[in-house]
Amino acid sequence: MRTEAQVPALQPPEPGLEGAMGHRTLVLPWVLLTLCVTAGTPEVWVQVRMEATELSSFTIRCGFLGSGSISLVTVSWGGPNGAGGTTLAVLHPERGIRQWAPARQARWETQSSISLILEGSGASSPCANTTFCCKFASFPEGSWEACGSLPPSSDPGLSAPPTPAPILRADLAGILGVSGVLLFGCVYLLHLLRRHKHRPAPRLQPSRTSPQAPRARAWAPSQASQAALHVPYATINTSCRPATLDTAHPHGGPSWWASLPTHAAHRPQGPAAWASTPIPARGSFVSVENGLYAQAGERPPHTGPGLTLFPDPRGPRAMEGPLGVR
């Protein structure tokens, strides 16, 4: 889900072209371009699997691909947490793990991935068209949420491929500050470049000064916040609603997958770092114009049962309010 790019070195404009403006137009665009290109964006993936042995049993795996430290993970069903979804489990990396029926076992698989086993009978049983969402709160990135469900035709025992979740939800609380600066900077940079369109512009050449310039990732936080303002909520229509079961569920028990590599907690070093994991690792670019997502060199991804987009337009205080009337 990442692209790599060399950050071009901006050559100084020829003397006398800009006069007093020369230094400003030299330094500012370079700084802003560096900020725009190097701004990293975390990603969340979700995998939902129905067990062959028990058709009412589901396993959800979620992971966070980012460099920040995870402060809380929330797993919900029926939609995103705070948008009609019901919390199934809350996992804190140090304080503990809590889960509620029909969740049977929530656990950390690595420092940046979790799994949750659900089971039930009758009304409390999950069904194939249920949407499951994982929300990762991290510092400094903020909160990121991805949702997934089993494809309608999936056979028991098989899993939906992990949703790569280009950027599925960004709570503005975590990113608005940095995003605002970057967004303004990028817009200003574009404005400067546009102004130079009909003038002799500085030549862009590959950098010779550093062996490798910073990596560029497909979505800067500024773009994420832009998307959050423009992409509407996707509505979930599920016929399977959770039911309450007053049951205690002890933790522990075997994991049904090999754990992801421990480097999942760190910023992955390009696509190769994830080659051994089930997460698709292909370069992509996410376009937020008209609220559409477009893969670089591909058709726009189908957001169908396995992928749901949930930007949060409610602003930084969206999580406040009595008892989850958030």
Epitope: H92, R95, D246, G324
Partner: antibody, heavy 114, light 113 residues
């Protein structure tokens, strides 16, 4: 910071039932998942259970199943614990606390006496 | 259920002294996935509710003085107060935060000479 305000002391007769409340005023998601803890006089703490405001689902310590019922009213931001068939063994201070026990109510003293 | 055993049951120390108290669990509180220990320490002063001091075996809750230090892993844990102050007079409880039911130890009563 979240505030948990519990209802006042209760004096009830054996065999009766009682309902204790805990009003949460917080600003983060986890502030509204409430634990209940019992502390008998001069004794340690016992976890009774927790309640999920999204589903009103609860987890219980097996020891308190049938004794305690945990519910929550999302609209008012209040969690409740009902205790039934009270005996002198139920006389204690009952606390509510947030999901990971980082904030506690002031406690409600329950006295069961004939 | 996980049984939490604290020792000693009481301590009598002078202000300025270093004090340690122990907590042992009947099962490991280490989460193998993220290598974190789910153990918490609480301080309860007379007539007050418990107050979270330490979580994750060693992480101080915000606002807790740095004279309080948690350590240990698996089944054996220690709370250390590097230089006891008069206001530290309290009961100290450890808690299994790993699995339900979330059991507490019997407590260590800290008394100041």
């Amino acid at each position: 910071e979240v505030q948990l305000q519990q209802s006042g002391p209760e004096v009830v007769k054996p065999g009766a039932s009682v309902r204790i409340s805990c009003k949460a005023s917080g600003n983060t998601f986890t502030d509204f998942f409430i634990n209940w803890v019992k502390q008998s006089h001069g004794k340690s703490l016992e976890w009774i259970g927790d309640v999920n405001p999204d589903s009103n689902g609860a987890n219980y310590n097996q020891k308190f199943k049938g004794k305690a019922t945990l519910t929550v009213d999302k609209s008012s931001g209040t969690a409740f614990m009902g205790l039934r068939s009270l005996t002198s063994e139920d006389s204690a201070v009952y606390y509510c606390a947030t999901l990971f026990f980082d904030n506690w109510g002031q406690g409600t003293t329950l006295t069961v006496s004939s | 259920d996980i049984v939490m055993t604290q020792s000693p049951s009481s301590l009598n120390v002078s202000a300025g002294e270093k004090v340690t108290m122990s907590c042992k669990s009947s099962q490991s509180l280490l989460n193998s996935g993220n290598q974190k220990n789910y153990l918490a320490w609480y301080q309860q002063k007379p007539g007050q509710p418990p107050k979270l001091l330490i979580y994750g075996a060693s992480t101080r809750e915000s606002g807790v003085p740095d004279r309080f230090t948690g350590s240990g892993s698996g089944t054996d844990f220690i709370l250390t107060i590097s230089s006891v102050q008069a206001e530290d007079l309290a009961l100290y409880y450890c808690q299994n935060a790993h699995s339900s039911p979330y059991t507490f130890g019997g407590g260590t009563k800290l008394e100041i000479k």
